[in-house]
Interface confidence: low
Protein backbone atom coordinates (compact mmCIF):
# COMPACT_ATOMS: atom_id res chain seq x y z
CA UNK A 1 0.00 0.00 0.00
CA UNK A 2 1.26 3.40 -0.84
CA UNK A 3 0.43 6.23 1.51
CA UNK A 4 0.61 9.80 0.45
CA UNK A 5 2.24 11.87 3.13
CA UNK A 6 0.02 14.40 4.77
CA UNK A 7 1.27 17.62 6.34
CA UNK A 8 0.92 17.02 10.06
CA UNK A 9 -0.58 19.24 12.69
CA UNK A 10 1.97 21.85 13.60
CA UNK A 11 3.45 22.27 17.02
CA UNK A 12 3.68 25.73 18.52
CA UNK A 13 7.01 27.49 18.23
CA UNK A 14 9.41 27.40 21.11
CA UNK A 15 9.73 30.66 23.02
CA UNK A 16 12.14 32.82 21.09
CA UNK A 17 11.06 36.34 21.98
CA UNK A 18 11.40 37.50 25.54
CA UNK A 19 11.12 40.93 26.99
CA UNK A 20 8.51 43.60 27.21
CA UNK A 21 6.10 42.14 24.66
CA UNK A 22 3.73 39.83 26.44
CA UNK A 23 2.97 36.26 25.47
CA UNK A 24 -0.56 37.04 24.34
CA UNK A 25 0.68 39.75 22.00
CA UNK A 26 2.91 37.24 20.22
CA UNK A 27 0.36 34.48 19.84
CA UNK A 28 -1.50 36.03 16.94
CA UNK A 29 1.49 36.63 14.65
CA UNK A 30 2.79 33.13 15.31
CA UNK A 31 -0.57 31.62 14.57
CA UNK A 32 -0.94 33.69 11.42
CA UNK A 33 2.52 32.76 10.22
CA UNK A 34 2.00 29.09 10.97
CA UNK A 35 -1.33 28.99 9.19
CA UNK A 36 -0.11 30.90 6.17
CA UNK A 37 3.05 28.88 5.74
CA UNK A 38 1.08 25.66 5.67
CA UNK A 39 -1.95 26.82 3.71
CA UNK A 40 -2.29 24.95 0.46
CA UNK A 41 0.90 23.00 1.00
CA UNK A 42 1.63 20.32 -1.57
CA UNK A 43 2.20 16.68 -0.74
CA UNK A 44 4.81 14.12 -1.64
CA UNK A 45 4.12 10.41 -1.55
CA UNK A 46 6.63 7.60 -1.50
CA UNK A 47 6.02 3.93 -2.17
CA UNK A 48 8.69 1.33 -1.56
CA UNK A 49 8.07 -2.14 -2.87
CA UNK A 50 10.15 -5.28 -2.94
CA UNK A 51 10.05 -7.21 -6.19
CA UNK A 52 8.63 -10.66 -5.73
CA UNK A 53 10.94 -12.08 -8.37
CA UNK A 54 14.13 -10.63 -6.90
CA UNK A 55 13.94 -10.42 -3.14
CA UNK A 56 16.84 -8.02 -2.91
CA UNK A 57 15.45 -5.62 -5.51
CA UNK A 58 13.25 -2.67 -4.71
CA UNK A 59 11.06 -0.32 -6.66
CA UNK A 60 10.66 3.17 -5.25
CA UNK A 61 7.86 5.32 -6.61
CA UNK A 62 7.46 8.93 -5.66
CA UNK A 63 4.96 11.58 -6.64
CA UNK A 64 4.38 15.26 -6.10
CA UNK A 65 0.85 16.49 -5.53
CA UNK A 66 1.53 20.19 -5.83
CA UNK A 67 0.41 22.55 -8.54
CA UNK A 68 3.84 23.93 -9.37
CA UNK A 69 6.16 22.77 -12.09
CA UNK A 70 8.86 20.32 -11.05
CA UNK A 71 12.40 21.42 -11.74
CA UNK A 72 14.31 18.52 -10.20
CA UNK A 73 13.74 15.22 -8.41
CA UNK A 74 16.36 13.64 -6.18
CA UNK A 75 16.09 10.11 -4.81
CA UNK A 76 18.33 9.11 -1.93
CA UNK A 77 18.66 6.36 0.61
CA UNK A 78 19.80 6.18 4.18
CA UNK A 79 17.80 9.28 4.99
CA UNK A 80 17.07 12.68 3.50
CA UNK A 81 19.46 13.91 0.86
CA UNK A 82 20.98 16.56 3.09
CA UNK A 83 21.05 14.58 6.32
CA UNK A 84 23.28 11.63 5.70
CA UNK A 85 21.44 10.26 2.72
CA UNK A 86 23.22 9.07 -0.39
CA UNK A 87 21.91 10.12 -3.77
CA UNK A 88 20.68 7.31 -5.97
CA UNK A 89 19.24 9.27 -8.87
CA UNK A 90 18.59 12.79 -10.05
CA UNK A 91 15.89 13.42 -12.62
CA UNK A 92 15.49 16.64 -14.54
CA UNK A 93 12.43 17.15 -16.75
CA UNK A 94 14.45 18.44 -19.69
CA UNK A 95 18.09 17.52 -19.20
CA UNK A 96 17.52 13.86 -18.47
CA UNK A 97 18.30 11.35 -15.77
CA UNK A 98 21.44 10.48 -13.85
CA UNK A 99 21.60 7.42 -11.63
CA UNK A 100 24.20 5.66 -9.54
CA UNK A 101 24.53 2.05 -8.44
CA UNK A 102 22.65 0.25 -7.14
CA UNK A 103 19.99 2.19 -9.04
CA UNK A 104 19.15 0.16 -12.12
CA UNK A 105 16.45 2.19 -13.78
CA UNK A 106 15.19 5.64 -12.93
CA UNK A 107 12.25 6.77 -15.00
CA UNK A 108 9.62 9.45 -15.15
CA UNK A 109 6.21 8.06 -14.45
CA UNK A 110 4.19 11.15 -15.26
CA UNK A 111 4.90 14.85 -15.18
CA UNK A 112 4.79 14.70 -11.41
CA UNK A 113 5.92 11.22 -10.42
CA UNK A 114 8.97 9.03 -10.87
CA UNK A 115 10.10 5.51 -10.16
CA UNK A 116 13.41 3.89 -9.47
CA UNK A 117 14.38 0.24 -9.56
CA UNK A 118 17.22 -0.76 -7.28
CA UNK A 119 19.36 -3.80 -7.97
CA UNK A 120 20.18 -5.88 -4.95
CA UNK A 121 23.66 -7.32 -5.13
CA UNK A 122 26.96 -6.68 -3.43
CA UNK A 123 27.92 -4.23 -0.74
CA UNK A 124 25.76 -1.44 -2.10
CA UNK A 125 22.51 -3.38 -2.14
CA UNK A 126 19.48 -2.19 -0.23
CA UNK A 127 17.79 -4.14 2.51
CA UNK A 128 14.30 -4.21 3.87
CA UNK A 129 14.75 -1.54 6.54
CA UNK A 130 16.55 0.98 4.38
CA UNK A 131 14.95 4.41 4.27
CA UNK A 132 14.38 5.87 0.81
CA UNK A 133 13.65 9.54 0.29
CA UNK A 134 12.39 11.56 -2.65
CA UNK A 135 12.80 15.30 -2.94
CA UNK A 136 10.80 17.31 -5.44
CA UNK A 137 12.05 20.78 -6.22
CA UNK A 138 9.12 22.77 -7.51
CA UNK A 139 8.33 26.36 -8.32
CA UNK A 140 6.75 28.12 -6.52
CA UNK A 141 6.22 25.66 -3.69
CA UNK A 142 9.87 25.07 -2.92
CA UNK A 143 11.42 21.67 -2.22
CA UNK A 144 9.45 18.90 -0.61
CA UNK A 145 10.81 15.59 0.56
CA UNK A 146 9.20 12.47 1.93
CA UNK A 147 10.71 9.17 2.98
CA UNK A 148 9.54 5.61 3.24
CA UNK A 149 10.84 2.12 3.85
CA UNK A 150 9.70 -1.48 3.91
CA UNK A 151 8.97 -2.99 7.29
CA UNK A 152 11.43 -5.82 8.08
CA UNK A 153 8.61 -8.36 8.05
CA UNK A 154 7.25 -7.39 4.64
CA UNK A 155 6.45 -10.17 2.24
CA UNK A 156 7.79 -9.84 -1.29
CA UNK A 157 5.53 -7.85 -3.51
CA UNK A 158 4.08 -5.82 -0.69
CA UNK A 159 4.30 -2.08 -0.61
CA UNK A 160 5.57 0.19 2.08
CA UNK A 161 3.65 1.20 5.18
CA UNK A 162 2.42 4.75 5.56
CA UNK A 163 5.09 7.18 4.48
CA UNK A 164 6.49 9.57 7.05
CA UNK A 165 5.28 13.11 6.67
CA UNK A 166 7.12 15.20 4.12
CA UNK A 167 10.12 17.27 5.07
CA UNK A 168 9.80 20.80 3.81
CA UNK A 169 13.00 22.27 2.46
CA UNK A 170 12.45 25.89 1.53
CA UNK A 171 15.55 26.10 -0.60
CA UNK A 172 14.45 27.53 -3.91
CA UNK A 173 14.89 31.16 -4.71
CA UNK A 174 11.58 32.92 -5.07
CA UNK A 175 9.46 30.71 -2.92
CA UNK A 176 6.57 33.04 -3.14
CA UNK A 177 4.42 31.59 -0.43
CA UNK A 178 6.95 31.55 2.35
CA UNK A 179 8.49 34.84 1.28
CA UNK A 180 5.13 36.53 1.22
CA UNK A 181 4.17 35.13 4.58
CA UNK A 182 7.46 36.16 6.12
CA UNK A 183 7.12 39.63 4.68
CA UNK A 184 3.65 39.86 6.12
CA UNK A 185 4.98 38.61 9.43
CA UNK A 186 7.72 41.23 9.46
CA UNK A 187 5.28 44.00 8.72
CA UNK A 188 2.92 42.76 11.36
CA UNK A 189 5.66 42.43 13.94
CA UNK A 190 6.89 45.93 13.13
CA UNK A 191 3.35 47.13 13.59
CA UNK A 192 3.25 45.47 16.99
CA UNK A 193 6.61 46.92 17.89
CA UNK A 194 5.40 50.42 17.00
CA UNK A 195 2.37 49.93 19.18
CA UNK A 196 4.66 48.95 22.02
CA UNK A 197 7.38 51.54 21.39
CA UNK A 198 6.89 53.10 24.78
CA UNK A 199 8.08 49.85 26.32
CA UNK A 200 11.69 48.60 26.38
CA UNK A 201 12.85 46.99 23.15
CA UNK A 202 12.57 43.20 23.16
CA UNK A 203 15.65 41.09 23.55
CA UNK A 204 15.92 38.52 20.84
CA UNK A 205 17.05 35.24 22.34
CA UNK A 206 18.21 32.21 20.43
CA UNK A 207 15.89 29.29 20.75
CA UNK A 208 17.03 26.24 22.61
CA UNK A 209 18.82 24.05 20.15
CA UNK A 210 20.46 20.67 20.20
CA UNK A 211 24.25 20.42 20.20
CA UNK A 212 24.24 19.28 16.58
CA UNK A 213 22.37 22.30 15.32
CA UNK A 214 23.99 25.23 13.59
CA UNK A 215 24.02 28.39 15.62
CA UNK A 216 20.54 29.63 16.29
CA UNK A 217 19.37 32.52 14.20
CA UNK A 218 17.93 35.24 16.41
CA UNK A 219 15.20 36.32 14.09
CA UNK A 220 11.60 35.77 14.96
CA UNK A 221 10.05 34.93 11.57
CA UNK A 222 12.83 32.43 10.97
CA UNK A 223 11.94 30.71 14.18
CA UNK A 224 8.31 30.84 13.29
CA UNK A 225 9.07 29.16 10.02
CA UNK A 226 11.05 26.51 11.80
CA UNK A 227 8.09 25.91 14.02
CA UNK A 228 5.93 25.51 10.97
CA UNK A 229 8.37 22.97 9.63
CA UNK A 230 8.29 20.61 12.58
CA UNK A 231 7.29 17.23 11.22
CA UNK A 232 7.46 13.70 12.58
CA UNK A 233 10.27 11.70 11.07
CA UNK A 234 11.11 8.04 11.14
CA UNK A 235 14.37 6.79 12.59
CA UNK A 236 16.93 6.32 9.86
CA UNK A 237 18.56 2.93 9.59
CA UNK A 238 21.87 3.14 7.79
CA UNK A 239 23.08 -0.41 8.14
CA UNK A 240 22.41 -1.19 4.52
CA UNK A 241 23.98 1.83 2.95
CA UNK A 242 27.01 1.33 0.72
CA UNK A 243 30.38 1.24 2.42
CA UNK A 244 31.83 3.98 0.24
CA UNK A 245 30.32 6.64 -1.90
CA UNK A 246 32.68 5.85 -4.72
CA UNK A 247 31.21 2.42 -5.16
CA UNK A 248 27.72 3.81 -5.03
CA UNK A 249 28.43 6.64 -7.44
CA UNK A 250 30.59 5.53 -10.33
CA UNK A 251 31.51 8.28 -12.75
CA UNK A 252 30.20 8.55 -16.24
CA UNK A 253 26.99 9.47 -17.95
CA UNK A 254 25.68 12.02 -20.38
CA UNK A 255 27.85 14.98 -21.25
CA UNK A 256 25.63 17.45 -19.47
CA UNK A 257 26.61 15.80 -16.20
CA UNK A 258 30.32 16.16 -16.89
CA UNK A 259 30.58 19.58 -15.31
CA UNK A 260 28.82 18.46 -12.16
CA UNK A 261 31.14 19.29 -9.25
CA UNK A 262 32.77 16.21 -7.81
CA UNK A 263 31.45 16.80 -4.34
CA UNK A 264 27.96 17.25 -5.65
CA UNK A 265 28.12 14.20 -7.83
CA UNK A 266 29.28 12.09 -4.95
CA UNK A 267 27.20 13.41 -2.16
CA UNK A 268 25.13 16.52 -2.64
CA UNK A 269 24.85 17.61 0.93
CA UNK A 270 26.36 20.04 3.36
CA UNK A 271 26.39 19.26 7.04
CA UNK A 272 25.55 22.80 8.02
CA UNK A 273 22.60 22.98 5.74
CA UNK A 274 20.15 21.11 7.93
CA UNK A 275 19.06 22.54 11.23
CA UNK A 276 18.05 20.06 13.89
CA UNK A 277 16.02 21.49 16.72
CA UNK A 278 14.40 19.77 19.67
CA UNK A 279 10.70 19.32 19.17
CA UNK A 280 8.13 18.12 21.68
CA UNK A 281 7.04 15.26 19.48
CA UNK A 282 9.05 12.06 19.81
CA UNK A 283 11.46 11.27 17.01
CA UNK A 284 10.86 14.55 15.29
CA UNK A 285 13.12 16.01 12.66
CA UNK A 286 13.17 19.42 11.13
CA UNK A 287 15.12 20.59 8.16
CA UNK A 288 15.55 24.14 7.02
CA UNK A 289 17.66 25.23 4.09
CA UNK A 290 18.64 28.12 1.92
CA UNK A 291 15.59 30.29 2.44
CA UNK A 292 16.08 30.65 6.17
CA UNK A 293 19.84 30.94 5.95
CA UNK A 294 19.37 33.85 3.59
CA UNK A 295 17.07 35.48 6.08
CA UNK A 296 19.72 35.14 8.75
CA UNK A 297 22.27 36.82 6.55
CA UNK A 298 24.23 33.62 5.95
CA UNK A 299 25.04 32.08 2.62
CA UNK A 300 24.12 28.42 2.76
CA UNK A 301 26.61 25.81 1.66
CA UNK A 302 26.08 24.17 -1.70
CA UNK A 303 23.88 21.33 -0.65
CA UNK A 304 22.84 19.70 -3.85
CA UNK A 305 23.12 19.58 -7.57
CA UNK A 306 20.37 22.05 -8.19
CA UNK A 307 22.51 25.15 -8.63
CA UNK A 308 25.23 23.98 -11.01
CA UNK A 309 23.79 20.80 -12.34
CA UNK A 310 22.66 21.75 -15.80
CA UNK A 311 25.20 23.88 -17.60
CA UNK A 312 24.36 22.57 -21.05
CA UNK A 313 21.12 24.21 -22.15
CA UNK A 314 20.67 21.76 -24.98
CA UNK A 315 20.28 18.75 -22.72
CA UNK A 316 21.68 16.07 -25.01
CA UNK A 317 19.65 13.29 -23.50
CA UNK A 318 15.90 13.20 -23.43
CA UNK A 319 14.20 12.18 -20.27
CA UNK A 320 13.64 8.46 -19.98
CA UNK A 321 10.14 7.08 -20.07
CA UNK A 322 8.23 6.64 -16.85
CA UNK A 323 7.66 3.34 -15.14
CA UNK A 324 4.09 2.65 -14.24
CA UNK A 325 1.09 4.87 -13.87
CA UNK A 326 -0.46 6.47 -10.90
Amino acid sequence: MRTEAQVPALQPPEPGLEGAMGHRTLVLPWVLLTLCVTAGTPEVWVQVRMEATELSSFTIRCGFLGSGSISLVTVSWGGPNGAGGTTLAVLHPERGIRQWAPARQARWETQSSISLILEGSGASSPCANTTFCCKFASFPEGSWEACGSLPPSSDPGLSAPPTPAPILRADLAGILGVSGVLLFGCVYLLHLLRRHKHRPAPRLQPSRTSPQAPRARAWAPSQASQAALHVPYATINTSCRPATLDTAHPHGGPSWWASLPTHAAHRPQGPAAWASTPIPARGSFVSVENGLYAQAGERPPHTGPGLTLFPDPRGPRAMEGPLGVR
Epitope: M1, T110, G321
Partner: antibody, heavy 119, light 107 residues
Framework: DVQLQESGPGLVKPSQSLSLTCTVT?????????WNWIRQFPGNRLEWMGY???????NYNPSLKSRISITRDTSKNQFFLQLNSVTTEDTATYYC????????????WGQGTLVTVSA | DILLTQSPATLSVTPGETVSLSCRAS??????LHWYQQKSHRSPRLLIK???DSISGIPSRFTGSGSGTDYTLSINSVKPEDEGIYYC?????????FGGGTELEIK
Protein backbone atom coordinates in the same frame (compact mmCIF):
# COMPACT_ATOMS: atom_id res chain seq x y z
CA ASP B 1 -6.26 -12.41 -9.85
CA VAL B 2 -7.79 -8.96 -10.17
CA GLN B 3 -11.08 -8.83 -12.07
CA LEU B 4 -13.25 -5.88 -12.98
CA GLN B 5 -16.87 -6.10 -14.04
CA GLU B 6 -18.98 -3.22 -15.35
CA SER B 7 -22.71 -3.15 -14.83
CA GLY B 8 -25.54 -0.71 -15.40
CA PRO B 9 -28.44 0.07 -17.71
CA GLY B 10 -27.80 -0.51 -21.37
CA LEU B 11 -30.22 2.21 -22.43
CA VAL B 12 -30.40 5.79 -21.19
CA LYS B 13 -32.62 8.61 -22.39
CA PRO B 14 -31.12 11.90 -23.54
CA SER B 15 -30.71 14.56 -20.83
CA GLN B 16 -30.77 11.91 -18.14
CA SER B 17 -27.83 10.61 -16.12
CA LEU B 18 -25.81 7.57 -17.01
CA SER B 19 -24.77 5.52 -13.98
CA LEU B 20 -22.40 2.56 -14.12
CA THR B 21 -20.82 0.36 -11.49
CA CYS B 22 -17.48 -1.39 -11.59
CA THR B 23 -17.17 -4.28 -9.18
CA VAL B 24 -13.63 -5.27 -8.33
CA THR B 25 -12.65 -8.68 -7.07
CA UNK B 26 -9.23 -9.92 -6.08
CA UNK B 27 -7.95 -6.57 -4.83
CA UNK B 28 -9.10 -3.82 -2.51
CA UNK B 29 -9.71 -0.52 -4.24
CA UNK B 30 -8.43 1.26 -1.13
CA UNK B 31 -5.07 -0.48 -1.24
CA UNK B 32 -3.48 1.17 -4.24
CA UNK B 33 -3.76 2.28 -7.83
CA UNK B 34 -6.01 4.52 -9.84
CA TRP B 35 -9.37 3.10 -10.89
CA ASN B 36 -10.36 4.42 -14.29
CA TRP B 37 -13.30 4.75 -16.60
CA ILE B 38 -12.59 4.62 -20.33
CA ARG B 39 -15.12 4.58 -23.13
CA GLN B 40 -15.02 3.49 -26.74
CA PHE B 41 -17.31 5.13 -29.25
CA PRO B 42 -18.97 3.26 -32.12
CA GLY B 43 -16.23 4.40 -34.50
CA ASN B 44 -13.68 2.69 -32.19
CA ARG B 45 -12.26 5.93 -30.80
CA LEU B 46 -11.14 5.50 -27.19
CA GLU B 47 -11.47 8.20 -24.55
CA TRP B 48 -10.13 8.27 -21.01
CA MET B 49 -12.84 9.70 -18.78
CA GLY B 50 -11.23 9.89 -15.37
CA TYR B 51 -10.18 7.96 -12.33
CA UNK B 52 -10.59 7.67 -8.60
CA UNK B 53 -7.45 6.85 -6.68
CA UNK B 54 -7.18 4.40 -3.82
CA UNK B 55 -7.33 7.36 -1.40
CA UNK B 56 -10.46 8.83 -2.93
CA UNK B 57 -8.83 11.57 -5.00
CA UNK B 58 -10.31 11.99 -8.45
CA ASN B 59 -9.01 13.23 -11.78
CA TYR B 60 -11.34 13.89 -14.70
CA ASN B 61 -10.95 14.54 -18.37
CA PRO B 62 -11.50 18.29 -18.75
CA SER B 63 -13.80 17.64 -21.69
CA LEU B 64 -16.21 15.95 -19.27
CA LYS B 65 -15.47 17.80 -16.07
CA SER B 66 -18.79 19.57 -15.77
CA ARG B 67 -20.77 16.34 -16.26
CA ILE B 68 -18.73 13.55 -14.71
CA SER B 69 -18.49 12.19 -11.20
CA ILE B 70 -16.56 9.11 -10.10
CA THR B 71 -17.28 7.82 -6.63
CA ARG B 72 -16.82 4.58 -4.73
CA ASP B 73 -18.25 2.30 -2.09
CA THR B 74 -15.32 0.80 -0.26
CA SER B 75 -17.46 -1.63 1.70
CA LYS B 76 -18.59 -3.25 -1.54
CA ASN B 77 -15.26 -2.73 -3.32
CA GLN B 78 -17.03 -0.90 -6.12
CA PHE B 79 -16.49 2.37 -7.91
CA PHE B 80 -19.04 4.25 -9.94
CA LEU B 81 -19.37 6.49 -12.96
CA GLN B 82 -22.07 9.10 -13.23
CA LEU B 83 -22.37 11.13 -16.41
CA ASN B 84 -25.02 13.80 -16.39
CA SER B 85 -27.02 15.37 -19.21
CA VAL B 86 -26.19 12.65 -21.69
CA THR B 87 -26.77 12.94 -25.41
CA THR B 88 -26.64 10.44 -28.21
CA GLU B 89 -22.95 11.34 -28.51
CA ASP B 90 -22.37 9.48 -25.23
CA THR B 91 -23.37 6.16 -26.77
CA ALA B 92 -20.32 3.97 -26.25
CA THR B 93 -18.87 0.87 -24.67
CA TYR B 94 -17.75 1.81 -21.18
CA TYR B 95 -14.75 0.09 -19.59
CA CYS B 96 -13.43 0.23 -16.09
CA UNK B 97 -9.71 -0.38 -15.85
CA UNK B 98 -6.64 -0.18 -13.68
CA UNK B 99 -4.09 1.50 -15.88
CA UNK B 100 -1.32 0.20 -13.68
CA UNK B 101 1.70 -1.85 -14.54
CA UNK B 102 2.89 -4.45 -12.11
CA UNK B 103 6.23 -6.15 -12.58
CA UNK B 104 4.94 -8.22 -15.47
CA UNK B 105 3.46 -5.17 -17.11
CA UNK B 106 -0.09 -6.43 -16.81
CA UNK B 107 -3.06 -4.12 -17.22
CA UNK B 108 -6.50 -5.01 -15.95
CA TRP B 109 -9.59 -4.01 -17.89
CA GLY B 110 -13.20 -4.95 -17.48
CA GLN B 111 -14.99 -6.60 -20.38
CA GLY B 112 -16.94 -3.43 -21.13
CA THR B 113 -20.62 -2.60 -21.17
CA LEU B 114 -22.47 -1.00 -24.05
CA VAL B 115 -24.60 2.00 -23.17
CA THR B 116 -26.93 3.41 -25.78
CA VAL B 117 -28.39 6.88 -25.38
CA SER B 118 -31.64 7.04 -27.25
CA ALA B 119 -35.11 8.40 -26.82
CA ASP C 1 -4.26 17.80 -24.39
CA ILE C 2 -1.68 15.61 -26.10
CA LEU C 3 -2.92 14.50 -29.51
CA LEU C 4 -1.79 11.09 -30.77
CA THR C 5 -1.98 10.56 -34.53
CA GLN C 6 -1.72 7.02 -35.83
CA SER C 7 -0.94 6.02 -39.39
CA PRO C 8 -1.94 4.36 -41.50
CA ALA C 9 -5.60 4.16 -40.54
CA THR C 10 -5.90 0.74 -42.14
CA LEU C 11 -3.33 -1.78 -43.23
CA SER C 12 -3.82 -4.96 -45.20
CA VAL C 13 -1.02 -7.51 -45.20
CA THR C 14 -0.41 -11.14 -45.96
CA PRO C 15 0.84 -13.56 -43.29
CA GLY C 16 4.61 -13.58 -42.94
CA GLU C 17 5.04 -9.91 -43.79
CA THR C 18 6.57 -7.40 -41.41
CA VAL C 19 4.54 -4.29 -40.68
CA SER C 20 5.24 -0.99 -38.98
CA LEU C 21 2.56 1.10 -37.31
CA SER C 22 3.25 4.74 -36.52
CA CYS C 23 2.11 6.91 -33.64
CA ARG C 24 3.02 10.59 -33.50
CA ALA C 25 2.42 12.73 -30.42
CA SER C 26 1.73 16.45 -30.53
CA UNK C 27 4.38 16.93 -27.87
CA UNK C 28 7.13 14.95 -26.23
CA UNK C 29 5.73 12.12 -24.12
CA UNK C 30 9.15 10.94 -23.01
CA UNK C 31 8.57 7.33 -24.01
CA UNK C 32 5.49 7.06 -21.85
CA LEU C 33 3.80 5.59 -24.88
CA HIS C 34 2.05 2.24 -24.77
CA TRP C 35 0.67 -0.02 -27.48
CA TYR C 36 -2.55 -1.99 -27.29
CA GLN C 37 -4.17 -4.58 -29.47
CA GLN C 38 -7.93 -4.90 -29.58
CA LYS C 39 -9.63 -7.77 -31.27
CA SER C 40 -13.31 -7.49 -32.14
CA HIS C 41 -15.61 -7.40 -29.13
CA ARG C 42 -12.71 -7.72 -26.72
CA SER C 43 -11.02 -5.39 -24.25
CA PRO C 44 -7.72 -3.83 -25.30
CA ARG C 45 -4.62 -5.86 -24.48
CA LEU C 46 -1.25 -4.33 -23.63
CA LEU C 47 1.48 -5.25 -26.13
CA ILE C 48 4.34 -2.85 -25.42
CA LYS C 49 4.88 -0.46 -22.55
CA UNK C 50 7.10 2.59 -22.39
CA UNK C 51 7.72 2.64 -26.12
CA UNK C 52 9.90 -0.45 -26.24
CA ASP C 53 9.47 -2.60 -23.14
CA SER C 54 8.19 -6.07 -23.89
CA ILE C 55 5.35 -7.63 -21.95
CA SER C 56 5.44 -11.17 -20.61
CA GLY C 57 3.03 -13.36 -22.50
CA ILE C 58 3.17 -11.23 -25.63
CA PRO C 59 4.88 -12.86 -28.64
CA SER C 60 8.36 -11.55 -29.34
CA ARG C 61 7.37 -10.59 -32.85
CA PHE C 62 5.81 -7.46 -31.37
CA THR C 63 8.46 -4.80 -30.81
CA GLY C 64 8.30 -1.09 -30.11
CA SER C 65 10.68 1.75 -30.74
CA GLY C 66 10.83 5.51 -30.76
CA SER C 67 11.32 8.49 -28.50
CA GLY C 68 10.22 12.08 -28.20
CA THR C 69 7.15 12.42 -30.38
CA ASP C 70 7.57 9.56 -32.89
CA TYR C 71 6.91 5.93 -32.03
CA THR C 72 6.60 2.73 -34.00
CA LEU C 73 5.11 -0.67 -33.34
CA SER C 74 6.60 -3.40 -35.53
CA ILE C 75 5.13 -6.83 -36.08
CA ASN C 76 7.54 -9.30 -37.58
CA SER C 77 6.15 -12.14 -39.62
CA VAL C 78 2.51 -11.28 -39.15
CA LYS C 79 0.13 -14.10 -38.25
CA PRO C 80 -3.62 -14.34 -38.90
CA GLU C 81 -4.36 -13.94 -35.19
CA ASP C 82 -2.73 -10.51 -35.25
CA GLU C 83 -5.77 -9.08 -36.98
CA GLY C 84 -7.37 -6.30 -35.01
CA ILE C 85 -7.05 -2.62 -34.15
CA TYR C 86 -3.83 -1.28 -32.66
CA TYR C 87 -3.87 1.76 -30.40
CA CYS C 88 -1.18 3.86 -28.87
CA UNK C 89 -1.82 5.47 -25.50
CA UNK C 90 0.07 8.20 -23.71
CA UNK C 91 0.08 8.18 -19.95
CA UNK C 92 2.55 10.99 -19.59
CA UNK C 93 0.03 13.61 -18.59
CA UNK C 94 -3.66 13.83 -17.97
CA UNK C 95 -5.94 13.75 -19.72
CA UNK C 96 -4.58 10.45 -20.93
CA UNK C 97 -5.15 10.12 -24.65
CA PHE C 98 -5.35 7.33 -27.20
CA GLY C 99 -4.45 7.37 -30.84
CA GLY C 100 -7.19 6.92 -33.39
CA GLY C 101 -6.06 3.35 -34.06
CA THR C 102 -4.66 1.39 -36.98
CA GLU C 103 -6.78 -1.44 -38.25
CA LEU C 104 -4.70 -4.41 -39.33
CA GLU C 105 -6.34 -6.73 -41.78
CA ILE C 106 -4.81 -10.06 -42.71
CA LYS C 107 -5.46 -11.09 -46.30
Amino acid sequence: DVQLQESGPGLVKPSQSLSLTCTVTGYSITSDYAWNWIRQFPGNRLEWMGYIRYNGNTNYNPSLKSRISITRDTSKNQFFLQLNSVTTEDTATYYCAIIYYDYDGFVYWGQGTLVTVSA
Amino acid sequence: DILLTQSPATLSVTPGETVSLSCRASQNVYENLHWYQQKSHRSPRLLIKFASDSISGIPSRFTGSGSGTDYTLSINSVKPEDEGIYYCLQLYSTPYTFGGGTELEIK
